[in-house]
């Protein structure tokens, strides 16, 4: 399954919505840093089949989907940059579900991979979690845009390695 | 490979200004903040201050706010440390370092190899 | 600004001893500790990060522990090449700070 170019550039719209959604100097929260575990072994280049590490993107693209759409992320962040955020995370979702259903068929798919959805989901939990124990406070806002940041480059990576496999 | 390649050694008079920089290669520039550390000979390492080079926001220590400006220019890859007005008390060995911001991994883990400034009449 | 005091100030030592190095920070950083090495004419190294993470490629016989205010930076067993200077920094809040450093010297 070849993504469109559109694709990338979305990729790219996105990293710079979450970077224009700072509100506070970041300098003031290193004491609120905290390890989310991300599971990088999910994105790393084991013996991935293609259409395996097409399902983690989507999961990861989902739950970043359901993490600034939340009542608390408006009234935390930029209503007008959130809106540009979620038209580009719904074009990227619908490119990916392409792809998903060329690669392996839509019933196959979520259970021949649910151990790495499954990781990318707890992953988001403890993101939510960490949200809910600090308040929803800027610097745990800030926080977790720096770690969405971090995560959706790596997706990025991910996808570069899949186009140059091809 | 992740590297910090600091300008040359200066040798400069009190009053005259200075700008030194710091090039990052081997990472992406704006995913780390760069901070500057300063040696005085025979002393310890003093934090001087911070740059987010993604939008070029800083911060100071009290010690050296208006003192100095630290800049960087995305574009290049490069971070800067300027003096308007040197002084003898500058004399000193200055060192950029990465730091990973607000994510969860190690704090100054590369180094640059240092720029020896000395202030002298 | 938060004051970060190491001690003792230098030591001597045998290669094979072991070493130990304290850092009291003058308020609670949780774990934002970190342990750099410094040798003659070369740029700090870093050590240990978050109060007790080993750095990639630094040897094992470095570890670190401690958290709130009392920090320790433990040498199992010492080598030629530890002979250096080595500063603690908190990472907790800026603006942030180093030890004053301890140098670590041949007996």
């Known amino acids: 399954c070849d993504l469109p170019q559109t694709h990338s550039l979305g990729n790219r719209r996105a990293l710079i919505l979450l970077a224009q959604m700072r509100r506070i100097s970041p300098f003031s929260c290193l004491k609120d840093r905290h390890d989310f575990e991300f599971p990088q072994e999910e994105f790393d280049d084991k013996q991935f089949q293609k259409a395996q590490a097409i399902s983690v993107l989507h999961e990861m693209i989902q739950q970043t989907f359901n993490l600034f759409s939340t009542k608390d992320s408006s009234a935390a962040l930029d209503e007008t940059l959130l809106d540009e955020f979620y038209i580009e995370l719904d074009q990227q979702l619908n490119d990916l579900e392409s792809c998903v259903m060329q690669e392996v068929g839509v019933i196959e798919s979520p259970l021949m991979y649910e151990d790495s959805i499954l990781a990318v989901r707890k992953y988001f939990q403890r993101i939510t979690l960490y949200l809910t124990e600090k308040k929803y406070s800027s610097c745990a806002w800030e926080v977790v845009r720096a770690e969405i940041m971090r995560s959706f480059s790596l997706s990025i990576n991910l996808q570069k390695r899949l186009k140059s496999k091809e | 490979e992740v590297q910090l390649v600091q300008s040359g050694a200066e040798v400069k008079k009190p009053g005259e200004s200075l700008k030194i920089s710091c090039k990052g290669s081997g990472y992406s520039f704006t995913s780390y903040w760069i901070g500057w550390v300063r040696q005085m000979p025979g002393k310890g390492l003093e934090w001087m201050g911070i740059?987010?080079?993604?939008?070029?926001?800083?911060a100071y220590s009290p010690s050296f706010q208006g003192q100095v400006t630290i800049s960087a220019d995305k574009s290049i890859s490069t971070a800067y440390l300027q003096w308007s007005s040197l002084k003898a008390s500058d004399t000193a060995m200055y060192y950029c370092?990465?730091?990973?911001?607000?994510?969860?991994?190690?704090?100054?883990?590369?180094w640059g190899q240092g720029t020896l400034v000395t202030v002298s009449s | 600004d938060i004051q970060m005091t190491q001690s003792p100030s230098s030591l001597s030592a045998s290669v094979g001893d072991r070493v130990t190095i304290t850092c009291r920070a003058s308020q609670s950083i949780n774990e934002f500790l970190n342990w750099y090495q410094q040798k003659p004419g070369k740029a700090p190294k870093l050590l240990i990060y978050?109060?007790?993470s080993l750095q990639s490629g630094v040897p094992s016989r470095f570890s670190g522990s401690g958290s709130g205010t009392d920090f320790t930076l433990t040498i199992s067993s010492l080598q030629p090449e530890d002979f250096a200077t080595y500063y603690c920094q908190q990472s907790y809040s800026t603006p942030l700070t180093f030890g004053q450093g301890t140098k670590v010297e041949i007996k």
């Open positions: 978050f109060a007790s």
């Open positions: 370092a990465r730091h990973p911001g607000l994510n969860w991994a190690p704090d100054f883990d590369y």
């Open positions: 740059i987010d080079p993604s939008d070029s926001d800083t």
